[in-house]
């Protein structure tokens, strides 16, 4: 997370850390708890070549990475069938946990938005994660969860910005309909935040608007952060994840 600050302990109870096996269980992406047994993340975190179930664990909301790990096993990794690269879209995936999480005030699910929600500019939105704090600058110990408030940008404006200084023709969309843009040169998500949630407060409820997906650098001029637009994939999500009763 570029800019922003350490998150208060009481906030973002749906935030999770994805861990890969190595010399230690290393954080590599974020995710969000959308059901007691399901985590939403980015497809590029776990695909297109899907890792072994044995190589992956989920850590629930933790103030400082690694300090009180209770890693959870995953029983299924579901990558969106249309995913190939983040830039093309469909950068969304689901992880099913072997056992449902015991929800509490500290750990609980985030609400998915209604299909009609557009998340217009001016809406109060935040992105969270344990990723880099600037380009090629790692989050330092004790690895606190960070938060930053990011401004939403309309897709057509974001697409026009991404065409500045790019070789892509103006008639070729860079920012697609299944994407959402947010951030500026002082506030952005970054490497290691991928898969994590972009949430917006709508009528008093935090809704997950996006999944950290891609961008050219972090907090670069004319290059806002790009997120997978959750509303675009609600039907796909609910094909697997039970709706709340």
């Amino acid at each position: 997370i570029v800019g922003g600050q350490e998150a208060p302990r009481s906030k973002w109870p749906w935030q999770v850390s994805l861990r890969v096996h190595g010399p230690y269980w290393m954080h590599f992406c974020g995710g969000s708890l959308i059901h007691p047994q399901w985590v939403l993340t980015a497809a590029h975190c776990v695909g297109p070549d899907v890792k072994d179930l044995a190589a992956l664990r989920v850590q629930l909301r933790e103030q400082h990475l690694y300090y009180q790990d209770q890693l959870l096993p995953v029983s299924r990794i579901i990558v969106h069938p249309q995913f190939y690269t983040a830039q093309i879209g469909a950068d969304i995936a689901l992880l099913e946990l072997e056992e449902p999480v015991n929800v509490s005030s500290h750990v609980h699910t985030v609400t998915l938005p209604p299909a009609s929600e557009t998340f217009p500019p001016g809406m109060p939105c935040w992105v969270t994660g344990w990723g880099d704090v600037d380009n090629d600058e790692r989050l330092p110990p004790p690895f606190p969860l960070k938060q930053v408030k990011v401004p939403i940008m309309e897709n057509h404006i974001c697409d026009a910005k991404y065409h500045l200084g790019a070789y892509t023709g103006d008639d070729v969309r860079i920012v697609r309909d299944d994407m959402l843009c947010a951030g500026n040169t002082r506030r952005d998500s970054c490497q290691g935040d991928s898969g994590g949630p972009l949430v917006c407060k709508v009528n008093g409820t935090w809704l997950q608007a996006g999944v950290v997906s891609w961008g050219e650098g972090c907090a670069q001029p004319n290059r806002p952060g790009i997120y997978t637009r959750v509303t675009y994939y609600l039907d796909w999500i609910h094909h697997y994840v039970p709706k709340k009763p």
Epitope: L53, A54, A55, S75, R76, E96, E98, E99, P100
Partner: antibody
Framework: EVQLVESGGGLVQPGGSLRLSCAAS????????MVWVRQAPGKGLEWVAF????????YYADTMKGRFTISRDNSKNTLYLQMNSLRAEDTAVYYC????????????WGQGTLVTVSS | DIQMTQSPSSLSASVGDRVTITCSAS?????MYWYQQKPGKSPKPWIY???DLASGVPSRFSGSGSGTDFTLTISSLQPEDFATYYC?????????FGQGTKVEIK
């Protein structure tokens, strides 16, 4: 001592049913995913089914889906395999195994129980 | 479903020989697991996460590989190594084992 002891095997007619049990001791049974693996006479190992620590997740080999049911009773430290509509090709030694907590290999195996399906 | 193919199905070797068993997965996996089984006995865990030796396994055993191709190697075969070895993946369900490789005395 960490131990798994299977029981319930025997001779059963085709189309019949059998329930295998596996008694666990020497470890906190409720912390571990458990697996059944079988081995037909003179053949290799075949994975049968998996159950997660709290029974929320179960998976079966395709040939056993719909006929076999894996379950567990954590209060009794016991794993079960209910086998229905048995066929001659289900004849095998059935092993109960524990999935290692950290590394996902099958680190503890029972001695096995022989199931013979024959008329 | 991922299929596992071991080769050879059986091999004859002498004490002191270097022995290599291969296991090929039908699609890419991260890790391979190996088990040893002797006649009339339950299988024993032998190698996990491709190259880590299970408790009590002698250092003459090693495991390697990535993607779809993995190997178990015995640098100098000993009398107690004559057994059948099985590979297994833990990529996704259903889990599958290789058909086994029987190591026999020449």
């Amino acid at each position: 001592e960490v131990q798994l002891v299977e029981s319930g095997g025997g001779l059963v007619q085709p189309g019949g049913s059998l329930r295998l049990s596996c008694a666990a001791s020497g470890f906190t049974f409720s912390d571990y995913g458990m697996v059944w693996v079988r081995q037909a006479p003179g053949k290799g190992l075949e994975w049968v089914a998996f159950i997660s620590s709290g029974s929320s997740t179960v998976y079966y080999a395709d040939t056993m889906k719909g006929r076999f049911t894996i379950s567990r009773d954590n209060s009794k430290n016991t794993l079960y395999l209910q086998m229905n509509s048995l066929r001659a090709e289900d004849t095998a030694v059935y092993y109960c195994t524990r999935r290692n907590y950290d590394d996902r290999y099958f680190d503890v195996w029972g001695q096995g129980t022989l199931v013979t399906v024959s008329s | 479903d991922i299929q596992m193919t071991q080769s050879p199905s059986s091999l004859s070797a002498s004490v002191g020989d270097r022995v290599t068993i291969t296991c090929s997965a039908s699609s890419s996996v991260t890790y391979m697991y190996w088990y040893q089984q002797k006649p009339g006995k339950s299988p024993k865990p032998w190698i996990y996460r491709t190259s880590d030796l299970a408790s009590g396994v002698p250092s003459r055993f090693s495991g390697s590989g990535s993607g779809t191709d993995f190997t178990l190697t015995i640098s100098s075969l000993q009398p107690e190594d004559f057994a059948t070895y099985y590979c297994q993946h833990y990529h996704s369900y259903p889990l599958t084992f290789g058909q086994g490789t029987k190591v026999e005395i020449k």
